[in-house]
Interface confidence: low
C-alpha cells in the first residue's frame, strides 16, 4: 500500500485583489478513507476554509468533482480575493473515525500573498536651487505594492548612483507597502541638462521596472561670469560699454546700469543665446557720450540673477585732459 502524500505544489501564490486564487492539492493514495479539509494557518486557531461535507462556503469552489469515487484532486478556488485573505493555506487529510474524524496528514502549505503593483515612482527635488559643487537631495516615492520585496535604483544620466538611503514601510506585515528613497547628488556646472532617474523593480512588473525622473535644471543655479569692455566709436566722442553675462542658469536675470551711482537703465534678460550645456549668455551695451563729461565717469553694472544678491562690476571712464579743459571753460 502506497504511503499517502499530500502534494501542494505551489509554495507561494501571488494574487491581486478581486482575482480568484486556485489552491492546488492532490493526494497520492485513496487510503485511508476520510475527508480532505482546507485550513488557513496552523494549530488550534486555524481557520476552516472548506469542508465538503458540511458548512456554507460561498466563495470556495472545488476544481474537480469530489463526489467521484477515485478523485485524488482536492484543489479549491477562492473567488474575489480581498486583502484579508492573505495567509498560508493547508489541505489536511482526516481518517474516518468514531465519533470524530482524526487528522492524519497535512500538506506543506501554500502561502497566498497579495500581489499589487507599485505606483509610478514620483521624484521630487530640493525646495531651493543650489550652485555647482554643492550636494542636493532627491526623493523618490512609490506606494501600494505587495509583497514587500522591492528593488530601487538611482541613476544620473544613465550612470548608477550609490549615495542613497531607502526605507520600506511598514516594517511588519501589511496589506500593502510603500517605499521612500533619498539620493544625494553633487552638482556640476554642466548639470543643467542632466537628469536623475529612480527605478523600481517588483515581482508584479514582470521585469519591466517603473521609472520616475527629475531634471537637475530644477535644482541647479549656475551663477554668471561677468565681463565688461569698452570700445571707442568712430565718431570719437562716444564710448560703447559692452557687458557680457556668461554661462548662467536659470534665465531670470536683471541688469541695472548706474552712472556715478545713479540708475540710468534697467533691463531684463530677453534675447539670450543658449550654450550646449544648457546655460545662457547675454550681452548688454550702453553708449556713453563722453563729450558731455567734465569728470571721470564711474559706470557700474549691477546683475541680479535668480533672486540672489546683486553682483556689481564697475568701470571708470577717464575723460581726457583736453575735454576737461573744454568743459571747465564752458562753465565759466
Amino acid at each position: 500500500e502506497e504511503e499517502l502524500q499530500m502534494i501542494q505544489p505551489e509554495k507561494l501564490l501571488l494574487v491581486a485583489v478581486g482575482e480568484s486564487a486556485t489552491l492546488n492539492c492532490t493526494v497520492t493514495s485513496l487510503l485511508p478513507v476520510g475527508p480532505v479539509l482546507w485550513f488557513r494557518g496552523v494549530g488550534p486557531g486555524r481557520e476552516l476554509i472548506y469542508n465538503q461535507k458540511e458548512g456554507h462556503f460561498p466563495r470556495v469552489t472545488t476544481v474537480s468533482d469530489l463526489t467521484k469515487r477515485n478523485n485524488m484532486d482536492f484543489s479549491i478556488r477562492i473567488s474575489s480575493i480581498t486583502p484579508a485573505d492573505a495567509g498560508t493555506y493547508y489541505c489536511v487529510k482526516f481518517r474516518k473515525g468514531s465519533p470524530e474524524n482524526v487528522e492524519f496528514k497535512s500538506g506543506p502549505g501554500t502561502e497566498m500573498a497579495l500581489r499589487a503593483k507599485p505606483s509610478a515612482p514620483v521624484v521630487s527635488g530640493p525646495a531651493a536651487r543650489a550652485t555647482p559643487e554643492h550636494t542636493v537631495s532627491f526623493t523618490c516615492k512609490s506606494h501600494g505594492f505587495s509583497p514587500r520585496d522591492i528593488t530601487l535604483k538611482w541613476f544620473k544620466n544613465g550612470n548608477e548612483l550609490s549615495d542613497f538611503q531607502t526605507n520600506v514601510d511598514p516594517a511588519g506585515q501589511s496589506v500593502s507597502y510603500s517605499i521612500r528613497s533619498t539620493a544625494r547628488v553633487v552638482l556640476a556646472p554642466w548639470d543643467v541638462r542632466s537628469q536623475v532617474t529612480c527605478e523600481v523593480a517588483h515581482v508584479t512588473l514582470q521585469g519591466d521596472p517603473l521609472r520616475g525622473t527629475a531634471n537637475l535644471s530644477e535644482a541647479i543655479r549656475v551663477p554668471p561670469t561677468l565681463e565688461v569692455t569698452q570700445q571707442p566709436m568712430r565718431a570719437g566722442n562716444q564710448v560703447n560699454i559692452t557687458y557680457q553675462v556668461r554661462n548662467f542658469y536659470p534665465q531670470n536675470l536683471q541688469l541695472t546700469w548706474l552712472e556715478n551711482g545713479n540708475v540710468c537703465r534697467t533691463e531684463t534678460a530677453s534675447t539670450l543665446t543658449e550654450n550646449k550645456d544648457g546655460t545662457y549668455n547675454w550681452t548688454s551695451w550702453l553708449l556713453v557720450n563722453t563729450s558731455d563729461q567734465r569728470d571721470d565717469v564711474v559706470l557700474t553694472c549691477q546683475v541680479k540673477h535668480d533672486g540672489q544678491l546683486a553682483v556689481n562690476k564697475s568701470l571708470v571712464l577717464e575723460v581726457s585732459a583736453h575735454q576737461k579743459d573744454q568743459s571747465s571753460d564752458a562753465t565759466h
Partner: antibody
C-alpha cells in the same frame, strides 16, 4: 457561547483620539474577522473596516483611511479600533462584529457597543 | 460605493399580520458563484444589531422561521409571516459584495 465585550463609554475633545477595545471569547479568536460599525445618534449603521486577527491584516473603508487604525492582541483575544483627529460628527456608538469570511461573511455576533462623545 | 435603498422607512403592523420590507441596491449583488451578497439585520430598541438573513435567503441560526429573505440581483425582500411584539425595531439590509454598505433602515412598530 460567543461573546464580544467592548470597553466603556468615552468623552473626548475635538482633535483627540479614542481607542475602543473588543474582547472575544467562546470561539477560537483567530478564526473570525472583526468588523467595526458605527451608529451616530438616531442614524443608521456605517461600516468602518475589518481586522483579521489571524494575520493581523486590516482593510478600512475609504472614508476612514488615514484616521482609523485597527490592531489586535492575540494573547488577550482583543481587537482595538483607534480613531484619531476626532470631530463632533464622530459622536456615535461604535460596535465590533465578528464574521467568518469563508463561511458566509455575515456579521453573526455583535459587541454591546461603546458610546464615544466628542465635545469641546 | 453601492447604495442601498429601503422602503418603507416606517412600517406600523398589527400583531399576527404579515410584514414586508423592500431593499434595492444600486448595482447587482449577484456574484458569479451564484450567491447574492445581501444580509438582513434587526436592531431592537436599546440593543446591538443581530443577524437575521445572510446571502439573500439563508436564515441565521436561532432565527424564527417566520422570517424569510428573497430576491436576486438588485431587488430583495424581507418577509415576516406573522408579526410578534418582539419583532419591533429597525431592520437594515446590508450588501457585502463590496465594501459593506447598509440601507437607511426600516422602523417596524406595533399598531
Amino acid at each position: 457561547q460567543v461573546q464580544l465585550v467592548q470597553s466603556g463609554a468615552e468623552v473626548k475633545k475635538p482633535g483627540a483620539s479614542v481607542k475602543v477595545s473588543c474582547k472575544a471569547s467562546g470561539y477560537t479568536f483567530t478564526s473570525h474577522d472583526i468588523n467595526w460599525v458605527r451608529q451616530a445618534p438616531g442614524q443608521g449603521l456605517e461600516w468602518m473596516g475589518i481586522s483579521n486577527p489571524s494575520g493581523g491584516s486590516t482593510y478600512y473603508a475609504q472614508k476612514f483611511q488615514g484616521r482609523v487604525t485597527m490592531t489586535r492582541d492575540t494573547s488577550t483575544s482583543t481587537v482595538y479600533m483607534e480613531l484619531s483627529s476626532l470631530r463632533s460628527e464622530d459622536t456615535a456608538v461604535y460596535y465590533c462584529a465578528s464574521s467568518r469570511r469563508y463561511w458566509n461573511g455575515a456579521f453573526d455576533y455583535w459587541g454591546q457597543g461603546t458610546l464615544v462623545t466628542v465635545s469641546s | 460605493d453601492i447604495v442601498m435603498t429601503q422602503s418603507p422607512l416606517s412600517l406600523p403592523v398589527t400583531p399576527g399580520e404579515p410584514a414586508s420590507i423592500s431593499c434595492r441596491s444600486s448595482q447587482s449583488l449577484l456574484h458569479s458563484n451564484g450567491y447574492n451578497y445581501l444580509d438582513w439585520y434587526l436592531q431592537k430598541p436599546g440593543q446591538s444589531p443581530q443577524l437575521l438573513i445572510y446571502l439573500g435567503s439563508s436564515r441565521a441560526s436561532g432565527v424564527p422561521d417566520r422570517f424569510s429573505g428573497s430576491g436576486s440581483g438588485t431587488d430583495f425582500t424581507l418577509k415576516i409571516s406573522r408579526v410578534e411584539a418582539e419583532d419591533v425595531g429597525v431592520y437594515y439590509c446590508m450588501q457585502a459584495l463590496q465594501t459593506p454598505t447598509f440601507g437607511q433602515g426600516t422602523r417596524l412598530e406595533i399598531k
